[in-house]
């Protein structure tokens, strides 16, 4: 698949005549028809097997044709083909005269031909333009042409299809000859095979994208070159997956039986001697002055637990010292500090013991705070009242005293004088800065539209059958809105019973 491109450059018809010799009046409005076909030793009109294209009127008599390719125009002319370019061609270029705007053959004069040229030959696919000039008795045409491959087609005949892609089916761009060029990190005939992380084990590792190393079952590590030992293997290694070869000093199926606890754990403290006495068992032989299973205890005055109330004993060179927990004091932590029994909470606060009575916490009533409820809360400190409202402390709460024209908990709402709908008889209410004003409908007046100025046409109850009466204020007439089942200007007729008119 490719495109034969024809670039018309200049047409000369100095005398402004047709092929017949007849002058065009006032000039030859020239357009071109191009026919591209298979190679013929003698080029003749007929089926344009490779394609045909026409131009609009490009000029009159003699003119240069500008390159329109940048603006998506018609020059160069494009003759696409969807087959392998054969390397040879025939080309017919006709110049025609169109007196009007209709360029269809049947709309042209019977002698509309200005000139025709026919060429044939070999043409290889390539970017370079071939320049040609054809001269007849009265005209001259300069043009150039070339064949290029369509997008995604490559090779000497535009027959090799290659569309760059980067998806599951391949990761490549196309070389000028149409061969694939793999994107970095991909290999294989169609660049579908990722190149794994450098050093990734060939057998034990694989990858689904470049620079990756995913391990096959039984293998681990950055390069999948480390075997995974048997599940639960504690102190063992493997040379192939799922093995568990025990380290020295360990035994059992999972190498979790400690045959050398002394070496592995050094459990004996303070310079004691450790002796293995079977699986996970040992004996510590303490140095003088120490005791305990691991010889961790120093024999001292604290052994008699002299500290009370949870105090901790610390050995000192000249005796011992008790560290008392909160709420206790004294040599042996025998004295207690304040508790709920001492009523430490002010202003009606409730006392709650904490840490088994060692200390306490006060729960304060509203308006009081502090660890002993000794501070009074001022609820007006945050200026909560809007629009100049005054904040007042009222026992456990606060309130806002609003300026005239405002309401709401925080004086945040503007009071509309119209909110009460003060205008009667459908009057329209207008808020003013210091009051309101009513605009009254026709038939009413007064500050609140309370005064009727026209006759109420409904006063005489002219509507029958419980119809609703409306006064038309503009005409002082009435309109009856009939209930279901009645008709007539006064709703006087039941539906279905035609009125008996006197005429």
């Amino acid at each position: 698949s490719g495109v034969f491109q024809l670039q018309l450059q200049e047409f000369i018809n100095e005398r402004g005549v047709l092929a017949s010799g007849r002058p065009c009046e006032p000039g030859c409005r020239t357009f071109f028809r191009v026919c591209l076909k298979h190679f013929q030793a003698v080029v003749s009109p007929g089926p344009c097997t490779f394609g045909t294209v026409s131009t609009p009127v490009l000029g009159t008599n003699s003119f240069a044709v500008r390159d329109d390719s940048s603006g998506g125009g018609r020059n160069p002319l494009q003759l696409p083909f969807n087959f392998t370019w054969p390397g040879t061609f025939s080309l017919i270029i006709e110049a025609w005269h169109a007196p009007g705007d209709d360029l269809r053959p049947e709309a042209l004069p019977p002698d509309a031909l200005i000139s025709k040229i026919a060429i044939q030959g070999s043409l290889a696919v390539g970017q370079n333009w071939l320049l040609d000039e054809q001269t007849s008795t009265l005209t001259r045409l300069r043009y150039s042409y070339r064949v290029i491959c369509s997008d995604n087609y490559y090779g000497d005949n535009c027959s090799r299809l290659c569309k760059k892609r980067n998806d599951h089916f391949g990761h490549y761009v196309c070389q000028p000859d149409g061969n694939l060029s793999c994107l970095p990190g991909w290999t294989g005939e169609y660049c579908q095979q990722p190149i794994c992380l450098s050093g990734c084990h060939e057998q034990n590792g694989y990858c689904s994208k470049p620079a990756e190393c995913l391990c096959r079952p039984g293998w681990q590590g950055r390069l999948c070159n480390e075997c995974i030992p048997h599940n639960g293997c504690r102190h063992g290694t493997c040379s192939t997956p799922w093995q568990c070869t025990c380290d020295e000093g360990w035994g059992g199926l999972f190498c979790d039986q400690d045959l050398n606890y002394c070496t592995h754990h050094s459990p004996c403290k303070n310079g004691a001697t450790c002796s293995n006495s079977g699986q996970r068992s040992y004996t510590c032989t303490c140095r003088p002055g120490y005791t305990g299973v691991d010889c961790e205890l120093e024999l001292s005055e604290c052994d008699s637990n002299p500290c009370r109330n949870g105090g901790s004993c610390k050995d000192q060179e000249d005796g011992y010292h008790c560290l008392c927990p909160p709420g206790y004091y004294g040599l042996h932590c025998e004295h207690s500090t304040l508790s709920c029994a001492d009523s430490p909470c002010f202003n009606g606060g409730s006392c709650r013991e904490r840490n088994q009575g060692a200390n306490y916490a006060c729960e304060c009533p509203p308006n009081f705070t502090g660890s002993n409820c000794e501070k009074k809360v001022d609820r007006c400190t945050s200026n909560p009242c809007a629009n100049g409202g005054q904040c007042l402390n009222r026992g456990p709460s606060r309130m806002c005293r609003c300026r005239p024209g405002f309401t709401g908990t925080y004086c945040e709402l503007h009071v509309s004088d119209c909110a009460r709908n003060p205008c009667a008889h459908g009057g329209t209410c207008h808020d003013l800065e210091n009051g309101l004003m009513c605009t009254c409908p026709a038939g009413f007046s007064g500050r609140r539209c309370e005064v009727r100025t026209s006759i109420d046409a409904c006063a005489s109850s002219p509507c029958f059958n419980r119809a609703t009466c409306y006064t038309d204020l503009s005409t002082d007439t009435f309109v009856c809105n009939c209930p279901y089942g009645f008709v007539g200007s006064r709703c006087e007729f039941p539906v279905g019973l035609p009125p008996s008119f006197p005429w």
């Epitope: 047709l18 092929a19 017949s20 010799g21 007849r22 003749s44 009109p45 007929g46 025609w96 269809r104 053959p105 049947e106 709309a107 042209l108 004069p109 019977p110 002698d111 509309a112 031909l113 000139s115 025709k116 007849s136 008795t137």
Partner: antibody, heavy 119, light 106 residues
Framework: EVQLVESGGGLVQPGGSLRLSCAAS????????MSWVRQAPGKGLEWVAM????????YYADSVKGRFTISRDNSKNTLYLQLNSLRAEDTAVYYC????????????WGQGTMVTVSS | SYELTQPPSVSVSPGQTASITCSAD??????VSWYQQKPGQSPVLVIY???KRPSGIPERFSGSNSGNTATLTISGTQTMDEADYLC?????????FGGGTKLTVL
């Protein structure tokens, strides 16, 4: 069916006049150039006159210039040839022909009508 | 004036190829049409624009035009092809016909 039917031929004396008609059907008459071509007995074809689709352009052979007039009435789909100052050498079968646009030639011909100029 | 010259007659055997020429100065720069006319009948367009066939004309009719000569070729000639053949082109605002060639199929 595309068709051209000539009429109006006959015997006329030298110096006399005739009006030939050609009724067109089966195609868009007002879109095409039309022509008259004649053929003397035993001779070849000779082009006589041509008219553009809208009647604004007319061409004549030198041999009939000033004597013959080509015209058309697109509303009636009819082509005319007014023959004046007839001569013996104008004796021929007169064909009406539709001219194909763009050097196609004459793609539809009528059956012809005979004009005889004789005293 | 511009004249199109044709041979008066051409003979051919059935099934053979017949070639009828039409000559004029620089004729190859113009388009040529060919007509077939049988005795007592109106002409019929068989080739236009040098080599194109109207619909309904058999493929055995072909044409070419270059230099000073246009050629009508009938390959595999049949007896029904026996007729007068006339070429036509343009000179200035005149339609020009050749004198015609009588094709005889022997």
């Amino acid at each position: 069916e595309v068709q051209l039917v000539e009429s109006g031929g006959g015997l006329v004396q030298p110096g006399g006049s005739l009006r030939l008609s050609c009724a067109a059907s089966g195609f868009t008459f007002q879109s095409h150039w039309m022509s008259w071509v004649r053929q003397a007995p035993g001779k070849g074809l000779e082009w006589v006159a041509m008219i553009s689709y809208d009647g604004t352009i007319k061409y004549y052979a030198d041999s009939v210039k000033g004597r013959f007039t080509i015209s058309r009435d697109n509303s009636k789909n009819t082509l005319y040839l007014q023959l004046n100052s007839l001569r013996a050498e104008d004796t021929a079968v007169y064909y009406c022909a539709k001219a194909g646009g763009g050097n196609v030639g004459f793609d539809i011909w009528g059956q012809g009508t005979m004009v005889t100029v004789s005293s | 004036s511009y004249e199109l010259t044709q041979p008066p007659s051409v003979s051919v055997s059935p099934g053979q190829t017949a070639s009828i020429t039409c000559s004029a100065d620089k004729l190859g720069t113009k388009y040529v049409s060919w007509y077939q006319q049988k005795p007592g009948q109106s002409p019929v367009l068989v080739i236009y624009q040098d080599a194109k066939r109207p619909s309904g004309i058999p493929e055995r009719f072909s044409g070419s035009n270059s230099g000073n000569t246009a050629t009508l070729t009938i390959s595999g000639t049949q007896t029904m092809d026996e007729a007068d053949y006339l070429c036509q082109s343009w000179d200035r605002s005149d339609v020009v016909f050749g004198g015609g060639t009588k094709l005889t199929v022997l």
